[in-house]
């Protein structure tokens, strides 16, 4: 059983999910990789790549691209026009076979909210950020983009139990939770 | 506050390696990646690639494939960047940055170590 | 690779000039873009982020703009101290790029 810091977004509805997950470019380079929702104890998978892996090569699943850049041991994931129905916890894997997946720490859980008056919520009306919450307070440091400097925390100790076949992930210690406005 | 510190000017023959440090104090090193770049006299900036000091991964610009290795030591908030196989045209002004949350699509570099300044000359 | 073409490369204006400054990238960066003050023998510094955001304790006179392909950074009041190298740096794809470079001076 492996303990991980599930890590918690939230958007407006229309905005943009960017997130990056990285792995050893020497043991996974040239394996697939793929983009899982968490649904009840199974995973779904919403996209994968392709094999070989080529940089720069970008798939699209619906609202859902992956490239992967296996020269930097990076995938890029990015879902558009967010709904509020995409809310729940997604974790990139190393896509072996459907039952053989490895998980790419860290699990996202993303919240999705409805914008002030129904309309899409946009980065570019906010500005601050939550990136520069003080070090002393760890947990809260947020990225790049974030607009209010407000950081919700979740109840202490909270603990989500997801599995993917053949392994049993306890999400402990959700605390780190990050309001992050992105373009639509 | 937010530093990243580097380790001083070096003067290393062709054919040799060199190895720039990076401190960084406050804030969580495992939750951002550090990123190098480098700036030879007169020139632009060039991003050599970035780690992730949490999982310890990295990936590197192909022209620097095989030649960079960027490692760390969490004990310390210490990143590292071994350049092997030097030559005169590596000659430049090597900086960390501390990029992007480490599981966030951004690479926007915030703050910058004071760069190194690694001569190469025989 | 995106390659980011800044123009112009260098620039003489007086105190309270508005200054102006392009980066164009060879392909669409959505608002993926950058944008660091850079003086002599000194780091980089950040000014913009994500095309138009500024930077916290950056002044208000330096603003950014665009998106996809043209971006222009602006100062709209040019003070002494702005006398520097300005970059502007994509991060949609990489491997990241920066652009030349405008070195901006006072007349």
């Known amino acids: 059983t492996t303990e991980l810091t599930e890590e918690k977004y939230e958007y407006k509805e229309g905005q943009t999910l960017e997130v990056k997950c990285d792995y050893a470019l020497e043991k996974y380079a040239n394996s697939r990789k793929a983009w899982q929702k968490m649904e009840g104890k199974m995973p779904k998978i919403l996209a994968k790549t392709e094999r070989p892996s080529e940089n720069s090569h970008p798939v699209q699943v619906g609202r859902i691209t992956l490239e992967d850049y296996p020269d930097h041991g990076l995938l890029q994931v990015r879902m558009t026009n967010l709904q509020v129905e995409d809310s729940g916890l997604y974790q990139c894997v190393i896509y072996q076979h459907p039952k053989e997946s490895h998980v790419l720490f860290n699990p996202i859980c993303l919240v999705v909210t409805k914008g002030s008056s129904g309309t899409p919520g946009s980065s570019e009306n906010s500005t601050q950020n939550v990136y520069r919450t003080p070090s002393t307070t760890a947990k809260a440091l947020g990225p790049r983009y974030t607009s209010p400097r407000t950081v919700t925390q979740a109840p202490p100790e909270s603990t989500v139990v997801v599995s993917t076949p053949g392994s049993e992930i306890n999400l402990t210690n959700v605390t780190d939770i990050i309001r992050v406005p992105v373009f639509n | 506050q937010v530093q990243l510190v580097q380790s001083g000017a070096e003067v290393k023959k062709p054919g040799a390696s060199v190895k720039v440090s990076c401190k960084a104090s406050?804030?969580?090193?495992?939750?951002?990646?550090i990123n190098w770049v480098r700036q030879a006299t007169g020139q632009g900036l060039e991003w050599m690639g970035r780690?992730?000091?949490?999982?310890?991964?990295?990936g590197y610009v192909q022209n620097f494939r095989g030649r960079v290795t960027m490692t760390r030591d969490t004990s310390i908030s210490t990143a590292y960047m071994e350049l092997s196989s030097l030559r005169s045209e590596d000659t430049a002004v090597y900086y960390c940055a501390r990029g992007g949350r480490t599981s966030i699509w951004s690479f926007v570099f915030d703050y910058w170590g004071q760069g190194t300044l690694v001569t190469v000359s025989s | 690779d995106i390659q980011m073409t800044q123009s112009p490369s260098s620039l003489s204006a007086s105190v309270g000039d508005r200054v102006t400054i392009t980066c164009q990238a060879s392909q669409d960066i959505s608002k993926h873009l950058n944008w660091y003050q850079q003086k002599p023998g000194k780091a980089p510094k950040l000014l913009i982020y994500d095309t138009s955001n500024l930077e916290t304790g950056v002044p208000s006179r330096f603003s950014g703009s665009g998106s996809g392909t043209d971006f222009t950074f602006t100062i709209s009041s040019l003070q002494p101290e702005d006398i520097a190298t300005y970059n502007c740096?994509?991060?949609?794809?990489?491997?990241?790029?920066f652009g030349g470079g405008t070195k901006v001076e006072i007349k």
């Open positions: 740096q994509q991060y949609d794809k990489l491997p990241l790029t």
């Open positions: 780690m992730n000091p949490k999982s310890g991964n990295a």
């Open positions: 406050g804030y969580t090193f495992t939750s951002y990646d």
